[in-house]
Interface confidence: medium
């Protein structure tokens, strides 16, 4: 079975961990796909490790475990995310997460954000 948080929220500009937990007494995971709606984000393969779509390669970091860390979130990242676990024996298991990206608290409070960099 797949266990996941059905709905999660994160702030614009921040990051979020997308995680699906697969549990089985007999089946072993051979491959895991992550999709944003119909768009392929990344694949984990037991044989080949992680592959990340070039579309997302600057914002998606594999892990922790078989999850994904999605960085520099924008409002456009709001939507459904799907994990698909390919297992042997046992077949295919799917999980769904709805991510809601919200305006950052600073924006909501009407504050400007300033960043300072150390002098070098």
């Amino acid at each position: 079975t797949i266990d996941t948080k059905r709905n999660i929220s994160a702030e614009e500009g921040g990051s979020v961990i997308l995680q699906c937990h697969f549990s089985s007494d007999t089946a072993e995971v051979t491959q895991v796909d992550w999709k944003q709606q119909d768009q392929l984000l990344a694949i984990y393969s037991v044989d080949l490790g992680w592959h990340v779509a070039s579309v997302f390669s600057d914002r998606v970091v594999p892990g922790p475990s078989l999850g994904l860390t999605f960085q520099s979130l924008t409002m456009n990242d709001t939507g459904e995310y799907f994990c698909t676990y390919h297992t042997y024996p046992g077949g295919i298991y799917k999980g769904r997460i709805f991510l809601k990206v919200q305006e950052s608290s600073d924006d909501r409070n009407g504050l400007a954000q300033f960043q300072t960099a150390p002098l070098g």
Partner: antibody
């Protein structure tokens, strides 16, 4: 919804240059590999080559001496030119979008070459006949 | 170049049958293997990528397996719209190469 629309001359004489263009409507142009594939009558599929938005191209060695694939990012278009055609180049020519993924190693995704994960959007095909 | 060999080259089956098509690579390609369906006069359609993974919108009766040099495409219960030609494609190295195709016909 991403769509590929292709066009070009359908009837050529031997020694002429085949010229086809494929326009990409919808979706991102920069994040994919843009591919040409052909299929001779009653035969299988043959990969001709591909190009990125930045103009980096890769060709099938069997055709490399005669092929040029170019890109026009201002129009979201890419083109195929095949020189000195013969009857053996008679085929249906398809443009397609190739999704590539980078193999991840620690904090970089550019250590390894990218790998195809399929051509998921195709043009309608253009029948090209070479005959004297 | 990596050679891809499909078997059988043609196959007759009935609606409801379980069908398996095999694809063999001339060298190991790990799981960099894709499957396409093509109907007469139409462009190919991506069914399965990375040996196992079903492309969005493709019915779950299609499944893929294999790694290394030997791969299979299985249709668990043939439907009338499944009669077509199927191609495997390796994406391990360029030039990208396809199998010669398997034509699936109605018995």
């Amino acid at each position: 919804q991403v769509q590929l629309q292709q066009w070009g001359a359908g009837l050529l004489k031997p020694s002429e240059t085949l010229s086809l263009t494929c326009a990409v409507y919808g979706g991102s142009f920069n994040d994919y590999y843009w591919t040409w594939i052909r299929q001779a009558p009653g035969k299988g599929l043959e990969w001709i080559g591909e190009i990125t938005h930045s103009g980096s191209a890769d060709y099938n060695p069997s055709l490399k001496s005669r092929v040029t694939i170019s890109v026009d990012t201002s129009k979201n278009q890419f083109s195929l030119k095949l020189r000195s055609v013969t009857a053996a180049d008679t085929a249906v020519y398809y443009c397609a979008r190739g999704l590539k993924l980078f193999r991840w190693k620690k904090t970089t995704v550019t250590t390894f070459p990218p790998y195809y994960y399929g051509m998921d959007v195709w043009g309608q095909g253009t029948t090209v006949t070479v005959s004297s | 170049d990596i050679q891809m060999t499909q078997s059988p080259s043609s196959l007759s089956a009935s609606v409801g049958d379980r069908v398996t098509i095999t694809c063999r690579a001339s060298q190991s390609i790990s799981s960099y293997l894709n499957w396409y369906q093509q109907k007469p006069g139409k462009a190919p359609k991506l069914l399965i990528y990375s040996a196992y993974s079903l492309q969005s919108g493709v019915p779950s009766r299609f499944s893929g397996s294999g790694s290394g040099t030997d791969f299979t495409l299985t249709i668990s219960s043939l439907q009338p719209e499944d009669f077509a030609t199927y191609y495997c494609q390796q994406s391990y190295s360029t030039p990208i190469t396809f199998g010669q195709g398997t034509r699936l016909e109605i018995k």
